[in-house]
Amino acid sequence: ECVTQLLKDTCFEGGDITTVFTPSAKYCQVVCTYHPRCLLFTFTAESPSEDPTRWFTCVLKDSVTETLPRVNRTAAISGYSFKQCSHQISACNKDIYVDLDMKGINYNSSVAKSAQECQERCTDDVHCHFFTYATRQFPSLEHRNICLLKHTQTGTPTRITKLDKVVSGFSLKSCALSNLACIRDIFPNTVFADSNIDSVMAPDAFVCGRICTHHPGCLFFTFFSQEWPKESQRNLCLLKTSESGLPSTRIKKSKALSGFSLQSCRHSIPVFCHSSFYHDTDFLGEELDIVAAKSHEACQKLCTNAVRCQFFTYTPAQASCNEGKGKCYLKLSSNGSPTKILHGRGGISGYTLRLCKMDNECTTKIKPRIVGGTASVRGEWPWQVTLHTTSPTQRHLCGGSIIGNQWILTAAHCFYGVESPKILRVYSGILNQSEIKEDTSFFGVQEIIIHDQYKMAESGYDIALLKLETTVNYTDSQRPICLPSKGDRNVIYTDCWVTGWGYRKLRDKIQNTLQKAKIPLVTNEECQKRYRGHKITHKMICAGYREGGKDACKGDSGGPLSCKHNEVWHLVGITSWGEGCAQRERPGVYTNVVEYVDWILEKTQAV
């Protein structure tokens, strides 16, 4: 339990870091949470008693004691950042603000049929932070139905004013709804020669790329490694932008690396969580505490447990000194990054893990898997669930995947003849079906959501969501898998596995131990040749060996086709149908999950 409620008619006194404009106190709280130092805030709502120039101001505050004196003030709303909370946090804001004009640089103006179309345009425009749309009731005729795309240095409006018959809102890039390409490559020996909007210190190009991703103006970056010839620029991370949204010039330079903001793929890769340790590296910054600690891991935990700590440096103990404990220096800075990075002094440095909760849980690294063999080991596929029916007797019905703490993604065809969700049980963290006894805990199903265009597996739309009655507490043996990014449509996945308790051959029985098989993806053209009597649509994806031998089969339906890309597992397919099992030149056909991301988000994020 953390302080999430807002304090009405209350102002926090002092501790000001900066002032931004937000359309609501709720969004002010989100901005505070994502700011590197903000712990509390005061927002001023519109009120006749308040000077209109102060309406919608969001004052971000910090305090050594995590609290500030409270003063009564009409129209002021105060609260705390979510940094102090351990729940998952999202910057996604789908709210539409009526009769508010959010000011910024109006860089694009076009006609749109609706506010929703204007918001989609903003979401799919690389520069857009927010928009204002003049409705068809807007007094000025030539401005009606005009969609203004806007951006600012901070990503928040420079001012907000009341204006009748307009609506405003934010880009939905942080809701994973952008169709922009997701370019994950880091280009070695490359400098992007475009204008710098900011610069920070970073230990490697990956951290630099993550910082670029959550910086509102950064579209791409250049990082100078510690071997860069100019000493003053070593470990410098340059955050960049351009009018076109792409680098205008690429210069070949040794010891520099460049890459792109991961904004369009941020829901499926970590961008806030810098979990690596940097050996023989010292991070400089303002000191918060110096503590004796057993190891650099223990030092990272201390940093994580101190809400104001952003990064740390651990100096290992000299032999037989201080009971083998080294010194742990907890540090912070104005922007969350070290003010300087030094090498060759023996320190081990890293960052707080407190910000990991701002990333999707699905990006957490899981246990290394055992390659080879067909039986899985515990914790190898923590998103895999077994869906049981209790009618007429209890048995395994289908597989499924955890995609959220109350959501299972599975196949629609699993529910043929299932009259009610009451007869369903979802078991997670299971390796062997024999573990399931009368008293084994399970999740009841509150609702079955079948795609309304589903008719039969072979004609597509074979996708369904199960809303659980209670939430899943994530552990090493039960945690979600990431959905693929829409910007990842062109990714070629080479490490894909199908898992399930299904038959090993066409006439068989459900397996006791969860089985796994590595299976290559097949192009839709190739797949279509193998299934002349069916239409293989772009909403399907196929996988299989030409010679057969490995495939999903009866009982695997609804389970995942999981593909590893850039160290993160993605739910690329849902086991759907095929002709026989593991037959030569008959690949398995799976629901192509990337084509249903919008549908999934619409259903799971519905209020």
């Epitope: 004691t65 995590e66 918060l288 505490d289 891991e297």
Partner: nanobody
């Protein structure tokens, strides 16, 4: 050198009360979140309660809600756990630890623990 010293444990009848203390030294007590964690005989560790560094935010496990109160005194570098309406299932070794018990805050520095025994 971080040192955590729990005290205040003992034997008590069901329904009774105890106040546990944890004195911390070797670190700036006030900047950390703190938790109480317990281990019953033959069981794993169970998070009991947490308090944030400012002291304004507290949280409790369902098993103890309404029966325990966590507090801190930053001036004395001390963490407290007031327990009342004790049940036999509260029998355990109680430890204080840095962190709020969230999944990414496991393992900080631990004290030796203080034994609480509740008999019927």
């Amino acid at each position: 050198q971080v040192q955590l010293q729990e005290s205040g444990g003992g034997s008590v009848q069901a329904g009774g009360s105890l106040r546990l203390s944890c004195a911390a030294s070797g670190l700036r007590f006030s900047i950390y979140d703190w938790s109480w964690v317990r281990q019953a005989p033959g069981k794993g560790l169970e998070w009991v309660s947490a308090i944030n560094s400012g002291g304004g935010v507290t949280s409790y496990a369902d098993s103890v809600k309404g029966r325990v109160t966590i507090s801190r005194d930053n001036a004395k570098n001390t963490l407290y756990l007031q327990m009342h309406s004790l049940k036999t299932e509260d029998t355990a070794v109680y430890y204080c630890a840095t962190g709020d018990g969230g999944s990414w805050y496991r393992d900080g520095d631990w004290g030796q623990g203080t034994q609480v025994t509740v008999s019927s």
